[in-house]
């Protein structure tokens, strides 16, 4: 069978191959469609209320006005000459429709690099058969899950036209250190070849690079965190954040429970104080930030002191806040 | 809202004529196919007559065929039905039918005028 | 020319009765089958439409099904206002083709 491929809404003329050019023609059309149960068959005595789909023109070819997609099938001629040979004719219809240009919805102005972000939505309305949408950084194709790229599709048929709108959800996690301005454009492939893609118009979202959270850092006094008995520790907690943050105080995982304050004093040191110390910043802006751990022990006259980190007992004994 | 509205029916003897006219409303006249179908007394429904929505081809029931001769003014949203060589047997109730053509078959019709043909 | 046989002529039902009218086809006319309603004095009215979709405003208790050559109209549960002749129509070829009518009376 030769292949057509028609536009919906276009008219099409199939030829009847070896018909006469004039009646009296000895022909007939069957048609296997989306119109028909089986075959259809037509003769250029006149199709009566098929006339306004298909007819059978004076010189025998197969004229449809106005293609559908109930058009789609398969087409067939029988013709006999003035000499009695017959010509058989054999057409595949396929039918399309080219949606119009594709539009990038709900984009976002800004995307945050590190987490994921959704660019925007794709929208394709009016094809025929579906097609594909696909999206494009900088130019380059991008594929769904892959680095940080993920896609949500969806597909609705409108119950009277039968021409389909495609929507695409594009999600992106920017790597940092990236492009401050990347440009993504969605691409619409018809699903029938030979037709090329319809680009949308490009968009250039800013991305934002959240500044790192500076380290909260520990500070202990004397150094190391070895004292003898009856000595002060001094703990601070130095957060470079501004406003300054809440301090809060951990002894072996367990909260302190005194007020915030970014010191600590552990006066006359006892073996009750012995431990792993932390402290806690809380941010209005952001989740609690925890220090480094660090140990404090007590060390007999004559002993080498340890080196800081390591762990000492357990017990509280008398605390001073700065 | 789509309205067919018939007009022209009435009392004629054999061999007379009568044209009948149907105005239509409530939707775009020039993209549907139009029919006449009719009924008489007591009897079933009978198509009579169909044309395309150009105008440019018509269709009729071989008992009205070189009597009856259907028309259409799509200026007008007018369609029309020229009766002539009228017989008894053509007394009934003529309907104005949208469609005709197999995208909808016959839809919606109008309320019917009598034609009745006696001497 | 297609004749449509259209059976029963004429039935007596009961309110809440199962109603079915079929309509056979001398050669296959596909799925180009409507089903009209019409009262005494009035105009039919179109119920279904090619073989099996419900007409706009036509309650669903109408259905119709078939192709080719049988074709059926169910009514799942009469009601008062269903009292009528029920007509089948062919639209794949001409002449147009009517079946003879079903009048659905009160038993």
């Known amino acids: 069978a030769q292949n057509i491929t028609a536009r919906i809404g276009e008219p099409l003329v199939l030829k009847c191959k070896g018909a006469p050019k004039k009646p009296p023609q000895r022909l007939e059309w069957k048609l296997n469609t989306g119109r028909t149960e089986a075959w259809k068959v037509l003769s250029p005595q006149g199709g009566g209320p098929w006339d306004s789909v298909a007819r059978v023109l004076p010189n025998g070819s197969l004229f449809l006005p106005a293609v559908g997609i109930q058009d789609e099938g398969i087409f067939r001629c029988q013709a006999m000459n003035r000499n009695g040979k017959e010509t058989k004719s054999n057409y595949r219809v396929r039918v399309y429709q080219i949606p119009g240009k594709p539009e990038i919805v709900d984009s976002a102005s800004e995307l945050t690099a590190g987490v994921p972000n959704k660019v925007g939505t794709c929208v394709s309305e009016g094809s025929y058969p579906a097609g594909t949408l696909s999206w494009h950084l900088d130019g380059k194709p991008l594929v769904p899950n892959e680095k940080g790229v993920s896609v949500k599709e969806q597909t609705r048929r409108h119950p009277e036209t039968g021409l389909f709108t495609l929507q695409s959800e594009l999600m992106v996690t920017p790597a940092r250190g990236g492009d401050p301005r990347p440009t993504f454009s969605c691409s619409f492939s018809p699903g029938l070849p030979r037709h090329r893609a319809l680009r949308t118009a490009p968009i250039q979202p800013r991305v934002w690079e959240p500044v790192p959270l500076e380290e909260v850092q520990l500070v202990v006094e004397p150094e190391g965190g070895a004292v003898a008995p009856g000595g002060t520790v001094t703990l601070t907690c130095e957060v470079p954040a501004q406003p300054s943050p809440q301090i809060h105080w951990m002894k072996d995982g367990v909260p302190l429970p005194l007020p915030p304050s970014p010191v600590l004093i552990l006066p006359e040191i006892g073996p009750q104080d012995q431990g792993t110390y932390s402290c806690v910043a809380t941010h209005s802006s952001h989740g609690p930030q925890e220090s480094r751990a660090v140990s404090i022990s007590i060390i007999e006259p004559g002993e080498e002191g340890p080196t800081a980190g390591s762990v000492g007992g357990s017990g509280l004994g008398t605390l001073a806040l700065a | 809202e789509v309205q067919l509205v018939e007009s022209g029916g009435g009392l004629v003897q054999p061999g007379g004529s009568l044209r009948l006219s149907c105005a239509a409303s409530g939707f775009t006249f020039s993209n549907y196919w139009m029919s006449w179908v009719r009924q008489a007394p007591g009897k079933g429904l009978e198509w009579v007559a169909s044309?395309?929505?150009?105008?440019?081809?018509?269709y009729y029931v071989d008992s009205v065929k070189d009597r009856f001769t259907i028309s259409r003014d799509n200026a007008k949203n007018s369609l029309y039905l020229q009766m002539n060589s009228l017989r008894a047997e053509d007394t009934a109730v003529y309907y104005c039918a949208r469609g005709g053509d197999i995208t909808t078959g016959l839809d919606y019709w109008g309320q019917g005028t009598l034609v009745t043909v006696s001497s | 020319d297609i004749q449509m046989t259209q059976s029963p002529s004429s039935l007596s039902a009961s309110v809440g009765d199962r109603v079915t009218i079929t309509c056979r086809a001398s050669q296959s006319v596909g799925s180009y089958v409507n089903w009209y309603q019409q009262k005494p004095g009035k105009a039919p009215k179109l119920l279904i439409y090619?073989?099996?979709s419900l007409a706009d405003g036509v309650p669903s208790r109408f259905s119709g099904s078939g192709s080719g050559t049988d074709f059926t109209l169910t009514i799942s549960s009469l009601q008062p206002e269903d009292f009528a002749t029920y007509y089948c129509l062919e639209f794949d070829e001409h002449p147009l083709t009517f079946g003879g009518g079903t009048k659905v009376e009160i038993k």
């Open positions: 044309i395309k929505n150009d105008g440019d081809n018509t």
């Open positions: 090619r073989a099996s």
